[in-house]
Interface confidence: low
């Protein structure tokens, strides 16, 4: 599984993280969890192994099985959302996952992230800096 090493977005804005996976994992449960350590991170939201999107509070997840990419969106970002997150795939044995560091810039602070043309407070990341975690 591959995703961005870190993402940055403004406070009160939103961000979208795209995590890519290999063929064969299409119908597995995909998840997004929070926590510095892989073994103690906790699931915030997960798919049901289908392409049906799921939403919980300010976090949503959608799996595009044709493109083998699942997309996580966090909205209404707050400073205390800044943390280490993981996108992962549930399977028998150890789950697959990759770490994503989320940085939230305080309101008024300059952001180095290019804005989406449709929403000046939305940052989209597709993993230009990729890392693998198994």
């Amino acid at each position: 599984i591959q995703g961005p090493e870190s993402v940055r977005a403004p406070e009160q804005g939103s961000l979208t993280v795209q995590c890519h996976y290999k063929q064969g994992w299409e119908t597995y449960i995909k998840w997004w969890c929070r926590g510095v350590r892989w073994d103690t991170c906790k699931i915030l939201i997960e798919t049901r192994g289908s392409e049906q999107g799921e939403k919980s509070d300010r976090v949503s997840i959608k799996d595009n099985q044709k493109d083998r990419t699942f997309t996580v969106t966090m909205e209404g970002l707050r400073r205390d959302d800044a943390d280490v997150y993981w996108c992962g795939i549930e399977r028998r044995g150890p789950d697959l996952g990759t770490q994503v560091k989320v940085i939230v810039d305080p309101e008024g602070a300059a952001s180095t992230t290019a804005s989406s043309p449709t929403n000046s407070n939305m940052a989209v990341f597709i993993g230009s800096h990729k890392r693998n975690h198994y």
């Epitope: 926590g35 350590r37 699931i43 997960e46 509070d57 300010r58 707050r78 205390d80 943390d83 280490v84």
Partner: antibody, heavy 126, light 107 residues
């Protein structure tokens, strides 16, 4: 001392809604997540969901999605659980419970429930 | 959802007995396993969290072990106040499911 005090017993008709409150004291309200758990008469424990009192963020068990709403009022250190479209099977004792690990401990999340409210009996009957 | 299965569902024991309750998860939950004690008409009480960590104030006769899918709660020497129902609970994956409970009764 650390405690959670819940609102009193409720009797509701099928189709109605109930809102149970849980007032926290003795600790920093916004630092610990709060769970809701219910127990039908003579049955086991059933986890309903969790709320982050700092952000208001919630996670609900799929079974209750669309029927349950958990909210908080930081000014009164109170969390609320509202369950709608009540049916007879919702007759139960509803508990709020504080998580054991503070949310600002980034190495652990939602380990267990160390402080419980006294429970609120909700009876659904026509 | 992760299913938690406890055994036995009930047991009869005498004061001083060593009692063992097992809990099995339908998939690996690492060490995210908690044990609660509940007495009739009362709220549950946390005994052990993270498989083996004794909650503050809980007597040392209670202990927990296991990892992955199989876990055990042991009461080394049963006391009169220990007659109650015991529940395991996983806190690995939402929803945080409970076992069906084990009722410990006086023989």
């Amino acid at each position: 001392q650390v405690q959670l005090v819940q609102s009193g017993a409720e009797v509701k008709k099928p189709g109605a809604s109930v809102k149970v409150s849980c007032k926290a004291s003795g600790y920093t309200f916004t630092t610990y997540a709060v769970h809701w758990v219910r127990q039908a008469p003579g049955q086991g424990l059933e986890w309903m969901g969790i709320i982050n009192p700092n952000s208001g963020g919630t996670n609900y068990a799929q079974k209750f999605q669309g029927r349950v709403t958990m909210t908080r009022d930081t000014s009164t250190s109170t969390v609320y659980m509202e369950l709608s479209s009540l049916r007879s099977e919702d007759t139960a004792v509803y508990y709020c419970a504080r998580d054991i690990v503070p949310m600002n401990n980034f190495y652990n999340y939602y380990y267990g429930m160390d402080v419980w409210g006294q429970g609120t009996t909700v009876t659904v009957s026509s | 959802d992760i299913q938690m299965t406890q055994s036995p569902s009930s047991l009869s024991a005498s004061v001083g007995d060593r009692v063992t309750i097992t809990c099995r998860a339908s998939q690996s939950i690492s060490s995210y396993l908690n044990w609660y004690q509940q007495k009739p008409g009362k709220a549950p009480k946390l005994l052990i969290y993270a498989t083996s960590t004794l909650q503050s104030g809980v007597p040392s006769r209670f202990s927990g072990s296991g990892s992955g899918t199989d876990f055990t709660l042991t009461i080394s020497s049963l006391q009169p106040e220990d007659f109650a129902t015991y529940y395991c609970q996983q806190s690995y994956r939402i929803p945080y499911t409970f076992g069906q409970g084990t009722k410990v009764e006086i023989k």
